[in-house]
């Protein structure tokens, strides 16, 4: 058993049929010694008396808010949550496996630049009685500070018969050094509580590996005289790290016909313009990637040819 | 050329070669070994590879103030990785494919380090890996880790040289 926060405790249980459970001793936070009784949740049934209460925690029915009273007055509370371990593996019932980039990916994180700011998100099908708490640091043995905001519900989607809820959180490294080569990864830890079930999820990454630039901006076409060719130009996204002579991007320019089956023409360039042939009803798209480190491509910025 | 104590390197040449290094480092990894890499424990990355850290002067402001600190750090890293890529981690079994880019990568690391420090000039305090023989069963994981680490190192080096070529070239 360990303390998650004041008056909230997590009991770690090996979860299998007829498991013996964990013996837990609760102590009433009071100077009083006599006439103390204990109840669980809203029930008025007295579970025991005395300053301490010993219980055997085996299942969710044994978890909940234990309250000690004296003469009708509440003295203190202890909320017990359960953390299940099945076959040596902690349960992951609350969050959905996003399976990208690999199985057992519950948290996904992205950064738009090297400033030390990043966003993480996760999915669940649970809509109520759900709380999240997020902590982060750079490194684990001698952790350096990363400040995370509160997790918020950022999207709702319908998937078949189920509703899916996306939560996200923004974090910022306290003393970021955008030009340095990271040697210690960022660690993100999410505590999830659904009713009386506790779970924790972690992710470890370098900012460089989660970089995904915003799409190029101000995408424009300029027809070239007496030619089917056009000059496409664009600019670095505002959110990208500066100076651009140091934090350089590379670009992919694509000409795509109306039909998905039509052959795509692609050009790769380090410049912020390119000359391509504009076909009727086609569109021109440009995306960006860090020039020197192969992290994710941005989403496409597109303009129609006509 | 970055002569100790002073003059500028051939920024544009360094930029071109460092960008080539980036491409090679990514084409060399993941290496096709004789078997799949299983998920391995996160033990410390091999041989305490040198990292370009915050105080090394490799940020745009640091380069403007005095690029020598940064260039020395890059040079140390290049020599370190050149030694690693020439070690039995890469020359031993499981053998690399004959057309593996590791050979080119190895040669390019040497080439860039020589551009930064021609024969006869010496920056002190080289951090050289102490390379005891690696067991064959460790090598795939070591290669994987070294190349991942090298990708990050050469990315920073390439940014330095790109910025230098754009803003510090005579």
């Amino acid at each position: 058993i360990w303390e998650l926060k004041k008056d909230v405790y997590v009991v770690e249980l090996d979860w299998y049929p007829d498991a013996p459970g964990e013996m837990v001793v609760l102590t009433c936070d009071t100077p009083e010694e006599d006439g103390i009784t204990w109840t669980l949740d809203q029930s008025s049934e007295v579970l025991g008396s005395g300053k301490t209460l010993t219980i055997q925690v085996k299942e969710f029915g044994d978890a909940g808010q234990y309250t000690c009273h004296k003469g009708g007055e509440v003295l203190s509370h202890s909320l017990l949550l359960l953390h299940k371990k099945e076959d040596g593996i902690w349960s992951t019932d609350i969050l959905k496996d996003q399976k990208e980039p690999k199985n057992k990916t519950f948290l996904r994180c992205e950064a738009k630049n090297y400033s030390g700011r990043f966003t993480c998100w996760w999915l669940t099908t649970i809509s109520t009685d759900l709380t999240f708490s997020v902590k982060s640091s750079r490194g684990s043995s001698d952790p350096q500070g990363v400040t995370c905001g509160a997790a918020t519900l950022s999207a709702e989607r319908v998937r078949g018969d189920n509703k899916e809820y996306e939560y996200s959180v923004e974090c910022q490294e306290d003393s970021a050094c955008p030009a340095a080569e990271e040697s210690l990864p960022i660690e993100v830890m999410v505590d999830a509580v659904h009713k009386l079930k506790y779970e924790n999820y972690t992710s470890s990454f370098f900012i460089r590996d989660i970089i995904k630039p915003d799409p190029p901006k101000n995408l424009q076409l300029k027809p070239l005289k007496n030619s089917r060719q056009v000059e496409v130009s664009w600019e670095y996204p505002d959110t990208w790290s500066t100076p651009h002579s140091y934090f350089s991007l590379t670009f992919c320019v694509q000409v795509q016909g109306k039909s998905k089956r039509e052959k795509k023409d692609r050009v790769f360039t380090d410049k912020t313009s390119a000359t391509v042939i504009c076909r009727k009803n086609a569109s021109i798209s440009v995306r960006a990637q860090d020039r020197y480190y192969s992290s994710s491509w941005s989403e496409w910025a597109s303009v129609p040819c006509s | 050329r970055a002569v100790p104590g002073g003059s500028s390197p051939a920024w544009t040449q360094c930029q071109q070669l460092s960008q080539k290094l980036c491409t090679l480092a990514w084409s060399a990894h993941p290496l096709v070994g004789h078997m799949d890499l299983r998920e391995e424990g996160d033990e410390e990355t091999t041989n305490d590879v040198p990292h370009i850290q915050c105080g090394d002067g490799c940020d745009p402001q640091g380069l403007r103030d005095n690029s020598q600190f940064c260039l020395q750090r890059i040079h140390q890293g290049l020599i370190f990785y050149e030694k690693l890529l020439g070690s039995d981690i890469f020359t031993g079994e499981p053998s690399l494919l004959p057309d593996s880019p590791v050979g080119q990568l190895h040669a390019s690391l040497l080439g860039l380090s020589q551009l930064l420090q021609p024969e006869g000039h010496h920056w002190e305090t080289q951090q050289i890996p102490s390379l005891s023989p690696s067991q064959p069963w460790q090598r795939l994981l070591l290669r994987f880790k070294i190349l991942r680490s090298l990708q990050a190192f050469v990315a920073v080096a390439a940014r330095v040289f790109a910025h230098g070529a754009a803003t510090l070239s005579p």
Epitope: - | G86, D88, T91
Partner: antibody
């Protein structure tokens, strides 16, 4: 094509030294290790050690440490194995081989130690 | 050191027979096991590497299997040129060690 060509047979007296050469051709010499293996008459194979031509790093079988020295001359793409303080039970065919998972061995050099 | 034990030490077989040679390592060597064929007066010739991977130019009748400590070399249909001594080798860790050999003779 890849070839490893070894020096000719040697007859040595007990206590002497022998140096066997292995000339490589048909590939970039410093890209692979050179292993040395020996086989006593009618016996099995015994690994002696390897050298990395790229940095002259060696790894010797404990059994031969102190008696064996492996070297290379990269200018001629040649590897050498010197065995000192020869005894009669060092009589064997000595082979050089490129990485185990590469199917390239020298033809062998018979070293006879006899008084 | 990892001991490599081959069995049988020798066997007699006829052309066309299916022949199986086993090799046991004294501790796990994953799939870092190689098989060689050696004929009198010749250098060993690599047949199979990393337990089951075939070498170009080696007939497909030679195959390997196993992992950990127990390995097998199979010759699906013995040919006259296959009469030789076969060795397995630990390619996992130093010192590299070989089995004592299995001599395949004509019945």
């Amino acid at each position: 094509q890849v070839q490893l060509v070894q020096s000719g047979a040697e007859v040595k007296k007990p206590g002497a030294s022998v140096k066997v050469s292995c000339k490589a051709s048909g590939y970039t010499f410093n890209r692979y290790l050179i292993h040395w293996v020996r086989q006593a008459p009618g016996q099995g194979l015994e690994w002696m050690g390897y050298i990395n031509p790229n940095n002259a790093g060696t790894n010797y079988n404990e059994k031969f440490k102190g008696r064996v020295t492996m070297t290379t001359d990269t200018s001629t793409s040649t590897a050498y194995m010197e065995l000192r303080s020869l005894r009669s039970d060092d009589t064997a065919v000595y082979y050089c081989a490129r990485n185990w998972d590469q199917a390239y061995w020298g033809q062998g050099t018979l070293v006879t130690v006899s008084s | 050191d990892i001991q490599m034990t081959q069995s049988p030490s020798s066997l007699s077989a006829s052309v066309g027979d299916r022949v199986t040679i086993t090799c046991r390592a004294s501790q796990s060597i994953s799939d870092y096991l190689h098989w060689y064929q050696q004929k009198p007066g010749k250098a060993p010739k690599l047949l199979i590497y990393y337990t089951s991977q075939s070498i170009s130019g080696v007939p497909s009748r030679f195959s390997g299997s196993g992992s950990g400590t127990d390995f097998t070399l199979t010759i699906s249909s013995l040919q006259p040129e296959d009469f030789a001594t076969y060795y397995c080798q630990n390619g996992h860790s130093f010192p590299f060690t070989f089995g004592q050999g299995t001599k395949v003779e004509i019945k």
